[in-house]
Interface confidence: medium
C-alpha cells in the first residue's frame, strides 16, 4: 500500500533570482484532486492553499509582491489527496539580488584577446562575504563560483572563440542574498583568420528573455525577466 504520493514540482516565476522590492510567484505542481498544498520556508509552514475545485487544478501559486532579504531562502512544498500526503518537493533556493553594493568586473590581459591566450576575470566587492559569481550571457548561462575576501579570480585558461560574449559578476552576502550585478564586460576573442567568420559563439537570447540588467533613468539597474539554466540553482546547493 502506498504511504505517500509522488513529490510535487516547485519553481519560481519569472525567476529564482529576484531583485529586492520586485514580485515573484512560487509555483507548486502536484496532482489533480489534491485538496491542500503547503509551502514551507526554511523548514517551517509558510503558506497554505486549497484549490477549488481540486479535481480540475494541479498547480497552485504563492505570490510574493515585495521581495526582500527576509523572504530569501529555501522553499519546498507538499500536497495531499484525501488524508495522504506527498513527499516534499525538491528545495527551491529563492535569491534576493540588488542588495547593497555593486561589484567591479575586470579582465586580464584585456577585453580583446587572441584565441589561445589565458584570460582571467576579477570580480571585486569590498563588502561581500567571500563568494562571487561570474555569469556569461547566453543560452547556456554559464555560472562560475569564486572565493576571496574582497576579490575573486575566475581563470578561464586558454580561451577559444566560444568564450566570446558578455560577462557580469555578483558578490554574495550569503547564499540567498546577492549584490547588484557588475557593469557588463564584453570579451572579444579573435581566432585564426580563416576560422574567425565561422567561429561558434554562444547564442544569446533576445534582451527581454535573458537575465540581463537594463540601464534606465527611471529605475537605475533593473532586472529583466529571465529563464536561466538551473546551473545557478545548483551552485547554491
Amino acid at each position: 500500500q502506498q504511504q505517500t504520493l509522488p513529490k510535487p514540482f516547485i519553481w519560481a516565476e519569472p525567476h529564482f533570482m529576484v531583485p529586492k522590492e520586485k514580485q515573484v510567484t512560487i509555483c507548486c505542481q502536484g496532482n489533480y484532486g489534491a485538496v491542500e498544498y503547503q509551502l514551507h520556508f526554511e523548514g517551517s509552514l509558510f503558506a497554505v492553499d486549497r484549490p477549488k475545485p481540486p479535481e480540475r487544478i494541479n498547480k497552485v501559486q504563492f505570490y510574493i509582491p515585495d521581495m526582500n532579504s527576509r523572504m530569501a531562502g529555501q522553499y519546498s512544498c507538499i500536497y495531499r489527496v484525501g488524508e495522504l500526503w506527498s513527499e516534499p518537493s525538491n528545495l527551491l533556493d529563492l535569491v534576493v539580488t540588488e542588495m547593497y553594493d555593486t561589484p567591479t568586473l575586470s579582465v586580464h590581459p584585456g577585453p580583446e584577446v587572441i584565441s589561445g591566450e589565458k584570460v582571467t576575470f576579477y570580480c571585486r566587492l569590498d563588502t561581500a562575504t567571500s563568494m562571487f559569481l561570474l555569469l556569461k550571457e547566453g543560452r547556456s548561462s554559464h555560472v562560475q563560483r569564486g572565493y576571496g575576501k574582497v576579490q575573486a579570480e575566475f581563470p578561464l585558461g586558454p580561451v577559444t572563440t566560444a568564450h566570446r560574449g558578455t560577462y557580469r559578476c555578483f558578490g554574495s552576502y550569503n547564499n540567498h542574498a546577492w549584490s547588484f550585478p557588475s557593469e557588463p564586460v564584453k570579451l572579444l576573442v579573435t581566432g585564426d583568420i580563416e576560422n574567425t567568420s565561422l567561429a561558434p559563439e554562444d547564442p544569446t537570447f533576445p534582451a527581454d528573455t535573458w537575465g540581463t540588467y537594463l540601464l534606465t533613468t527611471e529605475t537605475g539597474l533593473q532586472k529583466d525577466h529571465a529563464l536561466w539554466d538551473h546551473t545557478a540553482q545548483n551552485l547554491l546547493r
Epitope: K20, E21, D66, N68, S69, R70, V96, E98, M99, Y100, D101, T102, D126, T127, Y173, A177, S179, F180, T217, G220, L221
Partner: antibody, heavy 120, light 107 residues
C-alpha cells in the same frame, strides 16, 4: 513612502557622549545601507560612516573612527550613532541617509538632521 | 581621500535662466558622481546619480553631465523652488566625499 525620522536636538557638555537615532519606515530596513554625515554651520557635508543593518557591518571614515559608533536595531528599524568625548568641533547637524536602490553609492533618502550643540 | 571641489560657492541667477554648477574631483571617479539639493530649511534630496541619471520624482529641468574628473549640474528654466544649495558627492571610493556646495540665489 520611505522616511527617515531623526531624534531631536541635543545640548551636551564637553567630554560627554550623545546617542542619536534614525527611525526608518516605508521599506525593508535590513535591505539598505544607512549612512551618517556631519555638516557644520554653513559648511559642506562630511561622511562619517555607514552600517549594513542586516549584518551590523560598519565602514567608517578614518577621521571619525575614534569619535562615532554606528549600531542598528533590526527589530525596531532604528539606526543609532553615538558620538563620544565631545568638543566644540563636534557641534554640527548630523544626518542619516539611506544608500539608494541603484547600487551606485548615492543616498536617495535623508533624515531631517539632528542638531548637536556642545557647550559648557 | 578624493577631494571634491565646487569652485563657485554662490551664484545669482534670474527666474527662467539656465544655470550650470560645476564640480571637480581630484582624480578620475568613473562617473560615480551624485548631486544633492539642500533647501534653506536643511532638507536634503537626491537629484542626480551616476553623473546623469535623474532620481525618481525630480523635475526634468535638472540634468547632469561629465566624465573623468569634471562634472556639472544644469538647471533649465530656473524656478523659485530651486533656490537651494547644491552639493556634489563622489561614490567611487570610500570615504565618500562631498563638494563644499554652491548656493543658488535669485537676482
Amino acid at each position: 513612502e520611505v522616511q527617515l525620522q531623526q531624534s531631536g536636538p541635543e545640548l551636551v557638555k564637553p567630554g560627554a557622549s550623545v546617542k542619536m537615532s534614525c527611525k526608518a519606515s516605508g521599506y525593508t530596513f535590513t535591505d539598505y545601507v544607512i549612512n551618517w554625515g556631519k555638516q557644520r554651520s554653513g559648511q559642506g557635508l562630511e561622511w562619517i560612516g555607514e552600517i549594513y543593518p542586516g549584518s551590523g557591518t560598519n565602514y567608517y571614515n578614518e577621521k571619525f573612527k575614534a569619535k562615532a559608533t554606528l549600531t542598528a536595531d533590526k527589530s525596531s528599524n532604528i539606526a543609532y550613532m553615538q558620538l563620544s568625548s565631545l568638543t566644540s568641533e563636534d557641534s554640527a547637524v548630523y544626518f542619516c541617509a539611506r544608500r539608494g536602490r541603484y547600487g551606485l553609492y548615492a543616498m536617495d533618502y535623508w533624515g531631517q538632521g539632528t542638531s548637536v550643540t556642545v557647550s559648557s | 581621500d578624493i577631494q571634491m571641489t565646487q569652485t563657485t560657492s554662490s551664484l545669482s541667477a534670474s527666474l527662467g535662466d539656465r544655470v550650470t554648477i560645476s564640480c571637480r574631483a581630484s582624480q578620475d571617479i568613473s562617473n560615480y558622481l551624485n548631486w544633492y539639493q539642500q533647501k534653506p530649511d536643511g532638507t536634503v534630496k537626491l537629484l542626480i546619480y551616476y553623473t546623469s541619471r535623474l532620481h525618481s520624482g525630480v523635475p526634468s529641468r535638472f540634468s547632469g553631465s561629465g566624465s573623468g574628473t569634471d562634472y556639472s549640474l544644469t538647471i533649465n528654466n530656473l524656478e523659485q523652488e530651486d533656490i537651494a544649495t547644491y552639493f556634489c558627492q563622489q561614490g567611487n571610493t570610500r570615504p565618500w566625499t562631498f563638494g563644499g556646495g554652491t548656493k543658488l540665489e535669485i537676482k
